[in-house]
Amino acid sequence: DSSKWVFEHPETLYAWEGACVWIPCTYRALDGDLESFILFHNPEYNKNTSKFDGTRLYESTKDGKVPSEQKRVQFLGDKNKNCTLSIHPVHLNDSGQLGLRMESKTEKWMERIHLNVSERPFPPHIQLPPEIQESQEVTLTCLLNFSCYGYPIQLQWLLEGVPMRQAAVTSTSLTIKSVFTRSELKFSPQWSHHGKIVTCQLQDADGKFLSNDTVQLNVKHTPKLEIKVTPSDAIVREGDSVTMTCEVSSSNPEYTTVSWLKDGTSLKKQNTFTLNLREVTKDQSGKYCCQVSNDVGPGRSEEVFLQVQYAPEPSTVQILHSPAVEGSQVEFLCMSLANPLPTNYTWYHNGKEMQGRTEEKVHIPKILPWHAGTYSCVAENILGTGQRGPGAELDVQYPPKKVTTVIQNPMPIREGDTVTLSCNYNSSNPSVTRYEWKPHGAWEEPSLGVLKIQNVGWDNTTIACAACNSWCSWASPVALNVQYAPRDVRVRKIKPLSEIHSGNSVSLQCDFSSSHPKEVQFFWEKNGRLLGKESQLNFDSISPEDAGSYSCWVNNSIGQTASKAWTLEVLYAPRRLRVSMSPGDQVMEGKSATLTCESDANPPVSHYTWFDWNNQSLPYHSQKLRLEPVKVQHSGAYWCQGTNSVGKGRSPLSTLTVYYSPETIGRR
């Protein structure tokens, strides 16, 4: 049953004289193992004998014997799966049909394989992509329908006969599906590769040439251009002529259009390979190139920078920066279109030439107010001198200058006056917009820069003002010099340091804290009576009668000021003691008699002592001695003694007469 035999192998194998063939092969015999195998060359079936006739290249039998001449052909298979064969070397006359005659116990099969052996190594085949574009990576493939384990080969790539630098990847296939050797080369062709010959060379293991295939590269690319200009340096003067020519070195496919560009913009009606510029103007300076297009895209030449030279144009001045702050640095830049660039500059300030300034830039490291004004310049190159442009204005800003505080009042100023001050300045940029005053007070500003102080205080010593724009400038403080009557007049005891005792030497000082003007007069007064005109009031020996309320007055040309009343207290021992009797010095017995010890003392008497006519002290110590009821025996002379912290004083004797009552007389 033939359906039981299934074979897989390449349909045809290719080789050349002296090489080898390796025939990958698999089979399946479903009824058991292979018992006999014969490899025929060009087998033909003989109907008479019911057998195949042909050259037997290989034969294996049950006993496994193989004739010795069969070493060239090897059966590398087995009894149930593998039918791989090798012929080494292979000869030209091996070409034709190989027949694998397989026999199992019950079945037979003839499998045919084509073998194509050439006289010389056949060439590989180069495969190219359908289109190749410059700079786009492509894969070149070199394919050879040959591979054999016993005959190593290599494929090498050449460009115009020179080995290519790019690394190729070689792969081989020896499978039942296909037998080949393949080399793949990744390559980014440039436009210059167009028309060049690429070769894939088949070599043996020693690098000996066997065969090759060649292709001509057709690299699609945009037109490649060259540009030429007359004059060659592309530097001309206004009115000269310029010619530019564009040459196409290569284009694939054919170019279709040509145009010229200036600074990237297409020039109208310029569609030939020559650009003629007659009587050029400075506006025609710029970067020129030609552009030629084909189906791949536009190609551009290198740029030619055409310089049309001309004398400087009227100049303008750029100021970095205006307005400028006084003290800052400022740079002036003279800007003038010219070709070639100006080599010399003349600078003007307010129309007057600035000496020694010949550069494009003028740098002023420290700007002052007088630097303000109009700056202009003139540029000069080899073709001539430009005109002076309108110039630029430098505005120098600074704080207000020479600020002064001015008192508007007639002098002198007296305490309580209304004072008007003004804040003046010499110059300011920008204008003064506000004023400040020191010290701050609840004062009126009736108009800008004027200060009114109502009821000026004696202690308003100095005032300063500031005029402000973007900055504030302070004036030196001005002294108001307010005149006022003496202040804080008071009486001060200089001596004695302790309390005043009668008989002491006493000095009182009339003090004041301040006075303006300084020239003063003093007045001392006691109970409305003028005592002296010096600053001190002196008592050589003070007496109790000097005690009392004292005031001093200090006056200057503005006015006079009195001190608070000051009480002068004189301490003295009790004096002028006398004993007074109530109801009188004659009292009837049985009645009541009160003796009072009267005295003058400072401080008051703190302790009294009573004495009788015998100078006997009585056991009474209060100011009053009360005798009740009075007896005749009480009659006699009494005196008292008063004591205070200063000393003692005694009274003269005072006689008390106690007479008998009518009752006593009646009893007698």
């Epitope: 040459e247 196409v248 290569s250 054919e254 030939t272 390979f273």
Partner: nanobody, 125 residues
Framework: QLQLVESGGGLVQAGGSLRLSCVGS????????MGWFRQAPGKEREFVAA????????TYSDSVKGRFTISRDNAKNTVYLQMNSLKRDDTAVYVC??????????????????WGQGTQVTVSS
């Protein structure tokens, strides 16, 4: 379609001169690289001379260098070949052709897309 018509050929004695003209129809002639080729009986076509559109690039074959001069007038869409010191070997049909592939391919006939019919030049001894 570009059409080219040659004129100026004829019979001339060796050492003599001829001036060939090639007129193109349409403006595209002015942007084409123009070449002259010749073909003698029984011989392959041979490159003679080529001129770029601007006239800035000119190429001659070694066999005519110093004797022939190629020029062009783009305003007239015309290319000229001034042939001096003619030799018997110069006998051939002279054909003008237009190329839009650039001067690197000026001597490669296969890169010329448009061809004239040719004009016969015969140099006698």
């Amino acid at each position: 379609q570009l059409q080219l018509v040659e004129s100026g050929g004829g019979l001339v004695q060796a050492g003599g001169s001829l001036r060939l003209s090639c007129v193109g129809s349409g403006d595209r002639v002015s942007i084409a690289l123009m070449g002259w080729f010749r073909q003698a009986p029984g011989k392959e076509r041979e490159f003679v001379a080529a001129i770029s559109p601007s006239g800035g690039r000119i190429t001659y074959s070694d066999s005519v260098k110093g004797r022939f001069t190629i020029s062009r007038d783009n305003a007239k869409n015309t290319v000229y070949l001034q042939m001096n010191s003619l030799k018997r070997d110069d006998t051939a049909v002279y054909v003008c052709a237009a190329n839009f592939r650039g001067y690197l391919s000026s001597s490669r006939g296969s890169d010329y897309a448009y061809w004239g019919q040719g004009t016969q030049v015969t140099v006698s001894s």
